[in-house]
């Protein structure tokens, strides 16, 4: 067992059928000695009586709001919590795996820059009772100092017959060097709890990992005289860290047709300009990239080609 | 059509060029270690990330762009001293932090040398001949090394009388590799960064 | 004490369906994850597919996805495997489990697919 | 496929002590537990131990398991003919948890 926060305490149970669960002793917080009696959530039957009540935690039943009282004063209270490991892997009951880039994928982060701040976030089909808590350090052993705000409810969408609730944090590094090399990786640790369940989820990552540019801006198409070329030109996104001649960006350019199954032509630079064909009803995409370290694309900043 | 990117001229900053080459080489060799030594802890969530370069060299701090100077999270108190005489600096008019800056980059790039060289010397003992060191990757690391031009003491190779664990041998490898790519991204960037000014 | 009673084993032609049930008494069905794990004659064991405590997720292995379903209904304490296009090489004793560290295995069933 | 390989056969006289290997890799094994099965003929399997080393009350103590890096091994001190059975290893994989790996299976045979 141990303290979550104040009052707030987590059993962590090895969850099989008929185990025999976790002793547990509780102490009320009082100066008081005797005439104390013991009762759990809204229930009336008292559970023992004396400063200290020792229980035998085996399953959910078990877990909840325990409260000391004295002549029909409330004394104190611990709410005990439980923490399922199945087969030697703790519970993953919570959140959903998003797959993505791999299997027991849950926490996702991404980074617009180098500065050091970062976004993640969540999967969930739990819609009530449902409460989270962020911490963050780069390194694990002699940790530095990452604050993240709260997560908050970011989006809300239908999957099939399920609603689908994704959640997200923001947080940033407290002293980074954008053009820092990285070789101890973020560490975010996320608590879960859901009613009386708890979970904890991690990622670690390097910010140069998870860098995705916003799309490109200011994305124009000048036609060239007596052709059916145009020139395609863009600016670095204002997210984007600076100098751009430091930080600098490689481009794709593609010309899509109005069907989905037409070729595609593609086009690669470094520059903020390029000339392409422009098909009757097709688009111009640009997305754009670390030129230096490949981690993802900017999603596509398009523009029709009429 | 997947056309291929323009290089850039090279004209004007002969490293730029180079240094191109060099991420390219490291990137390459890096993938080719991952693949080839699939079942040996070599990709980057599992390998310590070390820096032979960490408290000989100064790369990041010596070769930080103006502006981020006003950032204090930038700037460590480390102070090395180097040559300062490098002809991807001729015809420029530069500051003695630019030759510090391109000197700290032509040390790296000679310890990495030193330190590629032993391990390849030990792979080449290796009875599975699983892997060997990119010539091309040594290649590009000495064109560089000879377009920066700085007038450096030779470091020799080590040579190590101990039969050599080829496990630790690979491992130590990866461990390289993911590091030399790192600064290889920060040469690039600071020589893009250079050809810019 | 935990019990698992299998049901539902037989032979089948290929190309039909079969449901196996299991009946779990002795503890709380509702609060745990559930196998099947299959063993063919002569051969080792091979995991077929798992559920968890509550329905929401299920699993199965590559050779039977997309072919048998798990589920499970609390209310009655059963799990079950409903097995379609079988084929020969589904032929096997079939066995559910609990999840966990310490487990519980069913009796066994035996499923023989032969035309 | 079987990831968790183990010998077809492994033999020995009444008292002899027989160990039997589960080799894995850096994606199961590696980072997950691992449990040891008993199957007599004709019965379900038999919990011997979880945990990498520990033993359910009720299997003898002449029954310990152990694990280093990717690999697994279960050792029976002083063997007894009614140890003669088939004894699978068991883990998870890192990324098709809660998917269950089953070695390939070894079968003991007691001497004389």
């Known amino acids: 067992i141990w303290e979550l926060k104040k009052d707030v305490y987590v059993v962590e149970l090895d969850w099989y059928p008929d185990a025999p669960g976790e002793m547990v002793v509780l102490t009320c917080d009082t100066p008081e000695e005797d005439g104390i009696t013991w009762t759990l959530d809204q229930s009336s039957e008292v559970l023992g009586s004396g400063k200290t009540l020792t229980i035998q935690v085996k399953e959910f039943g078990d877990a909840g709001q325990y409260t000391c009282h004295k002549g029909g004063e409330v004394l104190s209270h611990s709410l005990l919590l439980l923490h399922k490991k199945e087969d030697g892997i703790w519970s993953t009951d919570i959140l959903k795996d998003q797959k993505e880039p791999k299997n027991k994928t849950f926490l996702r982060c991404e980074a617009k820059n180098y500065s050091g701040r970062f976004t993640c976030w969540w999967l969930t089909t739990i819609s009530t009772d449902l409460t989270f808590s962020v911490k963050s350090s780069r390194g694990s052993s002699d940790p530095q100092g990452v604050t993240c705000g709260a997560a908050t409810l970011s989006a809300e969408r239908v999957r099939g017959d399920n609603k689908e609730y994704e959640y997200s944090v923001e947080c940033q590094e407290d002293s980074a060097c954008p053009a820092a090399e990285e070789s101890l990786p973020i560490e975010v640790m996320v608590d879960a709890v859901h009613k009386l369940k708890y979970e904890n989820y991690t990622s670690s990552f390097f910010i140069r990992d998870i860098i995705k540019p916003d799309p490109p801006k200011n994305l124009q198409l000048k036609p060239l005289k007596n052709s059916r070329q145009v020139e395609v030109s863009w600016e670095y996104p204002d997210t984007w860290s600076t100098p751009h001649s430091y930080f600098s960006l490689t481009f794709c350019v593609q010309v899509q047709g109005k069907s989905k199954r037409e070729k595609k032509d593609r086009v690669f630079t470094d520059k903020t300009s390029a000339t392409v064909i422009c098909r009757k009803n097709a688009s111009i995409s640009v997305r754009a990239q670390d030129r230096y370290y490949s981690s993802s694309w900017s999603e596509w900043a398009s523009v029709p080609c009429s | 059509r997947n056309l291929p990117v323009a290089t850039p001229d090279p004209g004007m900053f002969p490293c730029l060029h180079h240094s191109q080459n060099l991420l390219r080489a490291v990137s390459n060799m890096l993938q080719k270690a991952r693949q080839t030594l699939e079942f040996y802890p070599c990709t980057s969530e599992e390998i310590d990330h070390e820096d032979i370069t960490k408290d000989k060299t100064s790369t990041v701090e010596a070769c930080l762009p103006l502006e981020l100077t006003k950032n204090e999270s930038c700037l460590n108190s480390r102070e090395t001293s180097f040559i300062t005489n490098g002809s991807c600096l001729a015809s420029r008019k530069t500051s003695f932090m630019m030759a510090l800056c391109l000197s700290s980059i032509y040390e790296d790039l000679k310890m990495y040398q030193v330190e590629f060289k032993t391990m390849n010397a030990k792979l080449l003992m290796d009875p599975k001949r699983q892997i060997f060191l990119d010539q091309n990757m040594l290649a590009v690391i000495d064109e560089l090394m000879q377009a920066l031009n700085f007038n450096s003491e030779t470091v020799p190779q080590k040579s190590s009388l101990e039969e050599p664990d080829f496990y630790k041998t690979k491992i130590k490898l990866c461990i390289l590799l993911h590091a030399f790519r790192i600064r290889a991204v920060t040469i690039d960037r600071v020589m893009s960064y250079l050809n810019a000014s | 004490q935990v019990q698992l009673v299998q049901s539902g084993g037989g032979v089948v032609q290929p190309g039909r369906s079969l449901r196996l049930s299991c009946a779990a008494s002795?503890?709380?069905?509702?609060?745990?994850?559930m196998h099947w794990v299959r063993q063919a004659p002569g051969k080792g064991l091979e995991w077929v597919a798992f559920?968890?405590?509550?329905?929401?997720?299920?699993y199965y292995a590559d050779s039977v996805k997309g072919r048998f379903t798990i589920s499970r209904d609390n209310s009655k304490n059963t799990l079950y495997l409903q097995m379609k296009s079988l084929r020969a090489e589904d032929t096997a004793v079939y066995y559910c489990?609990?999840?966990?560290?310490?487990?519980?295995w069913g009796q066994g069933t035996m499923v023989t697919v032969s035309s | 496929s079987y990831v968790l390989t183990q010998p077809p056969s492994v033999s020995g006289t009444p008292g002899q002590r027989v160990t039997i290997s589960c080799s894995g890799g850096?994606?199961?094994?590696?980072?997950?537990?691992v449990k040891w099965y008993q199957q007599l003929p004709g019965t379900a399997p038999k919990l011997l131990i979880y945990g990498n080393d520990q033993r359910p009350s009720g299997v003898p103590d002449r029954f310990s398991g152990s694990k280093s890096g990717t690999s697994a091994s279960l050792a029976i001190t002083g063997v007894q003919a009614e140890d003669e059975a088939d004894y699978y290893c068991q883990s998870y994989d890192r990324g098709t948890h809660p998917a269950l790996l089953f070695g390939t299976g070894t079968k003991v045979t007691v001497l004389g």
């Open positions: 002795g503890f709380t069905f509702s609060s745990y994850g």
């Open positions: 559920i968890r405590y509550d329905g929401s997720n299920k």
């Open positions: 489990k609990t999840h966990g560290s310490h487990d519980n």
């Open positions: 850096r994606s199961n094994i590696g980072p997950n537990t």
